[in-house]
Interface confidence: low
């Protein structure tokens, strides 16, 4: 007869490992006992369990409650055992020694490999601001056995760098994602993807990018200069910008206080029926936590009685 086993048994941390040992004998042969031992190189054999055809299962105190026979129905020639709740320390070499009659003893070895799935963590980098150079967006770390694979899934353009630290029974892999922040990245997902043989599917951790920025300011409303004449109603100036966080707006007049009757409503400056006193230089100040911008315009209210043209001067400043 001969023993049937596996060269390598692979199990995920916390799962039950079946250590196979089956004697395929000739007709009439019987198995008297099967002895299991841990036989790591450089160490003496450590008894694990004994399956006896008459006396049943014996388990070493070191493995009490963790070694069982497979559930029935059992073949009397099957000396396999279950190692419950595998831990990293269980990884190593095991030997089954089968005593048969009348054929004698047989032995076989197998290696138990315990996979330790990673528990990845994602850590965002410093606050992202438009105008920065290459900046750390996030780092992702995963430790397992064997070493996990850490990659990134994103439509954002960037560069990655990885480093690995080996421990006695595992390895930690850290991957960093660097990018040059731009406003188009706002709200884009940056996903760390961790692959490992102990995972049924890749683990994914998504971080949403937030990039602070403030666009240049401009003022709309003076496009048709002929509309800015004495008596016109509903005249308004609108300050245009965008930012993250959303900006706030403030209106001032460079050459004096805002005329009475002029209404400030956020980004909009509303005028009462126009008079010449509304002529002047108006400044829109846009700001958020990231930056501030100014845009100024010159309003020249035309008097229809006069045949002089109006000049509009647009100036933007940061």
């Amino acid at each position: 007869g001969e023993l049937e086993t596996s060269d390598v048994v692979t199990v995920v941390l916390g799962q039950d490992a079946k250590l196979p040992c089956f004697y395929r004998g000739d007709s009439g042969e019987q198995v008297g006992q099967v002895a299991w031992a841990r036989v790591d190189a450089g160490e003496g054999a450590q008894e694990l369990a004994l399956l006896h055809s008459k006396y049943g299962l014996h388990v070493s105190p070191a493995y009490e409650g963790r070694v069982e026979q497979p559930p029935p129905p059992r073949n009397p020639l099957d000396g396999s055992v279950l190692l419950r709740n595998a831990v990293q320390a269980d990884e190593g070499e095991y030997e089954c020694r089968v005593s048969t009659f009348p054929a004698g003893s047989f032995q076989a070895r197998l290696r138990l490999r315990v996979l330790v799935p990673p528990l990845p963590s994602l850590n965002p980098g410093p606050a992202l601001e438009e105008g920065q150079g290459l900046t750390l967006a996030a780092s992702c770390t995963a430790e397992g056995s064997p070493a996990p694979s850490v990659t990134w899934d994103t439509e954002v353009k960037g560069t990655t760098s990885s480093r690995s630290f080996k421990h006695s029974r595992s390895a930690a892999v850290t991957s960093e994602f660097h990018l040059v922040p731009s406003r188009s990245m706002n709200g884009q997902p940056l996903t760390c993807v961790v692959s490992h043989p102990g995972l049924l599917q890749d683990q994914r951790i998504t971080h949403i990018l937030h990039v602070s920025f403030l666009a240049e300011a401009s003022v709309r409303g003076l496009e048709d200069q002929n509309l800015w004449h004495i008596g016109r109603e509903g005249a308004m100036l609108k300050c245009l910008s965008e930012g993250q966080p959303p900006p706030s707006y403030n209106w001032t007049r460079l050459d004096g206080p805002l005329p009475s009757g002029v209404r400030v409503d956020g980004d909009t400056l509303g005028f009462p029926p126009l008079t010449t006193e509304h002529s002047g230089i108006y400044v829109c100040h846009v700001s958020n936590e990231f930056s501030s911008r100014d845009s100024q315009v010159t309003v020249d209210v035309l008097d229809p009685q006069e045949d002089s043209g109006k000049q509009v001067d647009l100036v933007s400043a940061s």
Epitope: S121, L122, N123, T141, I205, H207, I208, H210
Partner: nanobody
Framework: EVQLLESGGGLVQPGGSLRLSCAAS????????MGWYRQAPGKERELVSS????????HYADSVKGRFTISRDNSKNTLYLQMNSLKPEDTAVYYC???????????WGQGTQVTVSS
């Protein structure tokens, strides 16, 4: 155990409004970004809006800009999505998502159905 529980969905006529809420429990800190995703039948899940841990940074998908407003109340561990001027194409299951940067975990709610129809 971390749980995200959405509420506030329902049936609304075009042009109407809804306010979605997402109550987070089991999270020991408010230091995490959150977002609203939606998934219409036969389509991929898409990000609608997201908000930073402080609430100071927000983002909106182009399709909802000017109509939806995201906010959060960290004292109540609750995320909100105010949806105005709703359109039939806003019909979807809306999911709340918490992106826990300091543990690397990513938690999802079970979703709440929003139907916009006359």
């Amino acid at each position: 155990e971390v749980q995200l529980l959405e509420s506030g969905g329902g049936l609304v006529q075009p042009g109407g409004s809804l306010r979605l809420s997402c109550a987070a429990s089991g999270l020991t800190s408010s230091g995490y970004a959150m977002g609203w995703y939606r998934q219409a039948p036969g389509k991929e899940r898409e990000l609608v809006s997201s908000i930073s841990s402080s609430g100071g940074l927000t983002h909106y998908a182009d399709s909802v800009k000017g109509r939806f407003t995201i906010s959060r109340d960290n004292s109540k561990n609750t995320l909100y999505l105010q949806m105005n001027s709703l359109k039939p194409e806003d019909t979807a299951v809306y999911y709340c998502d918490a992106d826990i940067a300091y543990t690397g975990a990513d938690y999802w709610g079970q979703g709440t159905q929003v139907t916009v129809s006359s």
